[in-house]
């Protein structure tokens, strides 16, 4: 599986970097950080255990979405 | 288990590039950021940058101009290149893994500091 | 002194959710040796007289029964944005 890969970046033109997720079951996730007045911070990658979720962060949310297709 | 192995040069003169390297011994280097902190004598921690072994980097944006980190997944190895330094850049420099999940920051093993001066 | 509970405390600027949260202890000489994350997780062979607890800004680290090798500087952490950023540690010194 193929999936983007990047870290607290404020943009997905920096979010371009492609992984190669070689263990059996991995998918692909995307971490999305809003918080009020602050901008969206975007961090993806791999995960074994990849799971939908939102939570609290600071005055705003974290969410987290999974997909297993390649750079999905 | 884990081990962290750092090396580097120690004194510097202002306007230098200060390159460290750090090894990783033992788990999984493909799963994790690796991370450089830092701590001025006396002082606290000051986070850095990071990298994985796709090469995807995150920095502290107040030194992101001076700053790289790069790796080498043929030898679980990567490093830190500070370029332009000044007295305020001394400060024991530690590698760190980032086992933070959904780009969270989570630094649980550490390498045993290098001591970088710059002075002229 | 040794035996007795010590309890630091960390004030977040503002509000992070109790995931975002972690402890360290160091020595002098020695690199940071992560305590606590998620506030309250006692991270890989830590000792249990060391608890956390806290949410949103405040956080507490709690060490039970103070032990010689107990005696460090501690270290709170956000870890849920870029950059990460630190305490500015606060000292446990032998009475």
């Known amino acids: 599986l193929l999936c983007y890969s990047c870290k607290a970046q404020v943009s997905n033109e920096d979010c371009l970097q492609v992984e190669n997720c070689t263990q059996l079951g991995e998918q692909c996730w995307t971490a999305r950080i809003r918080a009020v007045g602050l901008l969206t911070v975007i961090s993806k990658g791999c995960s074994l255990n990849c799971v939908d979720d939102s939570q609290d962060y600071y005055v705003g949310k974290k969410n987290i979405t999974c997909c297993d297709t390649d750079l999905c | 288990q884990v081990h962290l192995q750092q090396w580097g040069a120690g004194l510097l003169k202002p306007s230098e590039t200060l390159s460290l390297t750090c090894a990783v011994y033992?788990?999984?280097?493909?799963?994790?950021?690796w991370s450089w902190i830092r701590q001025p004598p006396g002082k606290g921690l000051e986070w850095i940058g990071e990298?994985?072994?796709?090469?995807?980097?995150s920095y502290k944006p107040s030194l992101k101009s001076r700053v790289t980190v790069s790796v080498d997944t043929s030898k679980n190895q990567f490093s830190l290149k500070l370029s332009y330094v000044t007295a305020a850049d001394t400060a024991v420099y530690y590698c760190?893994?980032?086992?933070?999940?959904?780009?969270?920051?989570?630094?649980?093993?550490w390498g045993q500091g290098t001591l970088v001066t710059v002075s002229s | 002194s040794p035996g007795e509970r010590a309890t630091l405390s960390c004030r977040a600027s503002?509000?992070?959710?109790?995931?975002?949260l972690a402890w360290y202890q160091q020595k002098p000489g020695q690199a940071p040796r992560l305590l606590i994350y998620?506030?309250?997780s006692r991270a890989t062979g830590i000792p249990e007289r060391f608890s956390g607890s806290g949410s949103g800004t405040d956080f507490t680290l709690t060490i039970s029964g103070l032990e010689p090798e107990d005696f460090a500087v501690f270290y709170c952490?956000?870890?849920?944005?870029?950059?990460?950023?630190f305490g500015q540690g606060t000292k446990v010194e032998i009475k």
């Open positions: 952490q956000q870890c849920g944005s870029s950059p990460p950023t």
């Open positions: 760190a893994r980032d086992r933070g999940d959904y780009g969270d920051f989570l630094f649980d093993y």
């Open positions: 503002q509000s992070i959710g109790s995931t975002y």
């Open positions: 033992g788990g999984s280097f493909s799963g994790y950021y």
């Open positions: 998620g506030a309250s």
């Open positions: 990298i994985n072994h796709s090469g995807s980097t």
